[in-house]
Interface confidence: low
């Protein structure tokens, strides 16, 4: 790994052992300045593997609202607008980090948590068995 | 929003103002117990809008490694295995939270940061402008 010299101006860390508790500033810095927010807003409808977005809310989590994609069909939409079952709509999943209040209901104490979310769907060729 | 009674066993918070600094336990809890890791492993190759995965590494960020999807084609793969430019491969993007070391190089002090990542690609019908 890359070793970086420690900044002498860092806050003191009480506990040097894992599980490590760190200080986190929740004033979010958004680096997405150059992105067009509308860009992917309608892909869920225009895709050949369209999906619905479901709201998942949990006040004990930060962020408290996460949107989950669910593929509308098992097959994919063909050129005629019909569902073709020779192809499959599948969710594209990603592991993301969230903060979970710990102990519960505490406003200033969290634990890092990894969760799997479905972001959208893509159309794939079915798992085809190739016989030698 | 939902108001939850504060747990009396919470650690004390020095600063009640935003930007708020909180304590975060970095011992990650993984809630993805029921997922089958093989499921989406080959979608990037089997998709009609295939993508490549690029490694994005930043030692000042947690997690330090993030994988970015880049669509292989402008069009989508048709039944004959050729690229059809009547359809478009587009990236499905998601905003995720990461921790940015602040001040730089500090092992135990972070700021929450929102970044936009491309998770995979989907095939969409192009937006056609009808001229009156």
């Amino acid at each position: 790994g890359i070793t970086i010299p420690r900044n002498p101006g860092c806050p003191n860390s009480e506990d040097k052992n894992f599980p490590r508790t760190v200080m986190v500033n929740l004033n979010i810095h958004n680096r997405n300045t150059n992105t067009n927010p509308k860009r992917s807003s309608d892909y869920y409808n225009r895709s050949t593997s369209p999906w619905n977005l479901h709201r998942n809310e949990d006040p004990e989590r930060y962020p408290s609202v996460i949107w989950e994609a669910k593929c509308r069909h098992l097959g994919c939409i063909n050129a005629d607008g019909n569902v073709d079952y020779h192809m499959n709509s599948v969710p594209i999943q990603q592991e993301i980090l969230v903060l979970r209040r710990e102990p519960p209901h505490c406003p200033n104490s969290f634990r890092l948590e990894k969760i799997l979310v479905s972001v959208g769907c893509t159309c794939v060729t079915p798992i085809v068995h190739h016989v030698a | 929003g939902i108001t939850i009674p504060r747990n009396p066993g919470c650690p004390n918070s020095e600063d009640k103002n935003f930007p708020r600094t909180v304590m975060v336990n970095l011992n990650i809890h993984n809630r993805n117990t029921n997922t089958n890791p093989k499921r989406s492993s080959d979608y990037y190759n089997r998709s009609t809008s295939p993508w490549n995965l690029h490694r994005n590494e930043d030692p000042e960020r947690y997690p330090s490694v993030i994988w970015e999807a880049k669509c292989r084609h402008l069009g989508c793969i048709n039944a004959d295995g050729n690229v059809d430019y009547h359809m478009n491969s587009v990236p499905i993007q998601q905003e995720i939270l990461v921790l940015r070391r602040e001040p730089p190089h500090c092992p135990n002090s972070f700021r929450l940061e929102k970044i936009l990542v491309s998770v995979g690609c989907t095939c969409v019908t192009p937006i056609v402008h009808h001229v009156a």
Epitope: N52, R72, L74, P91, P126, V131 | N36
Partner: antibody, heavy 119, light 110 residues
């Protein structure tokens, strides 16, 4: 507890109609594809019909095409099967089952409701 | 939408292993890795045992395993137990419809 509960079965004359219901509980119904499967007395399983999670897509087995209609009401967590022009060969136990969007397996089944078509 | 072919019955003694075959064609079992297996006890609903040829849902005993060769899928039950006595059905995705089932196999534990 994840559960599917069918109802609406009974005795009907050939050419008659029946509407089956399947009440879902213990999971987010609108996230799942649903199907109906039937089993004639002493026979094997036969896939009947499929509906997408949002209700927008439906598919039918050749044996019921044009006679049966599958539908769902996600606000009521309920799946339906409207059966018209019933025939003696439609006599069976009808099961509803849940299909995740990852694969073509049916991971949760109801207990079944019996439909008898006889004069 | 003709059914996949399964043996009508198989039997085995407790502790033994048995295998149930499910033969299709190059349009279903041979083409796709979307083969599922279900167990059904008398007067009960079917239960998913295997999906995508080899994958077991959580809660299903590891005594149940699936495999495939060419146009034939197989379900193997090792360490046979009395409670395994039931009917077993295979199912596959096909090139003409989302699902087709096998005719079913009655397993008798001697």
């Amino acid at each position: 507890e994840v559960q599917l509960l069918e109802s609406g079965g009974g005795l009907v004359q050939p050419g008659g109609s029946l509407r089956l219901s399947c009440a879902a509980s213990g999971f987010t119904f609108s996230h799942y594809h649903m199907i109906w499967v039937r089993q004639a007395p002493g026979k094997g399983l036969e896939w009947v019909s499929y509906i997408g999670s949002s209700g927008g897509q439906t598919v039918y087995a050749d044996s019921v095409k044009g006679r049966f209609t599958i539908s769902r009401d996600n606000s009521k967590n309920t799946l339906y099967l409207q059966m018209n022009s019933l025939r003696a060969e439609d006599t069976a136990v009808y099961y509803c089952a849940r299909v995740p969007d990852y694969y073509y397996g049916m991971d949760v089944w109801g207990q079944g409701t019996t439909v008898t078509v006889s004069s | 939408q003709s059914a996949l072919t399964q043996p009508a019955s198989v039997s085995g003694s407790p502790g033994q292993s048995i295998t149930i075959s499910c033969t299709g064609s190059s349009d279903d079992v041979g083409r796709y890795d979307y083969v599922s297996w279900y167990q059904q006890h008398p007067a009960k609903a079917p239960k998913l045992l295997i999906y995508e040829v080899t994958h077991r849902p959580s809660g299903v005993s590891n005594r149940f395993s699936g495999s495939k060769s060419g146009n034939t899928a197989s379900l193997t039950i090792s360490g046979l137990q009395g409670e395994d006595e039931a009917d077993y059905y295979c199912s596959s995705h096909t090139s003409t419809s989302p699902w087709v089932f096998g005719g079913g196999t009655k397993l008798t534990v001697l």
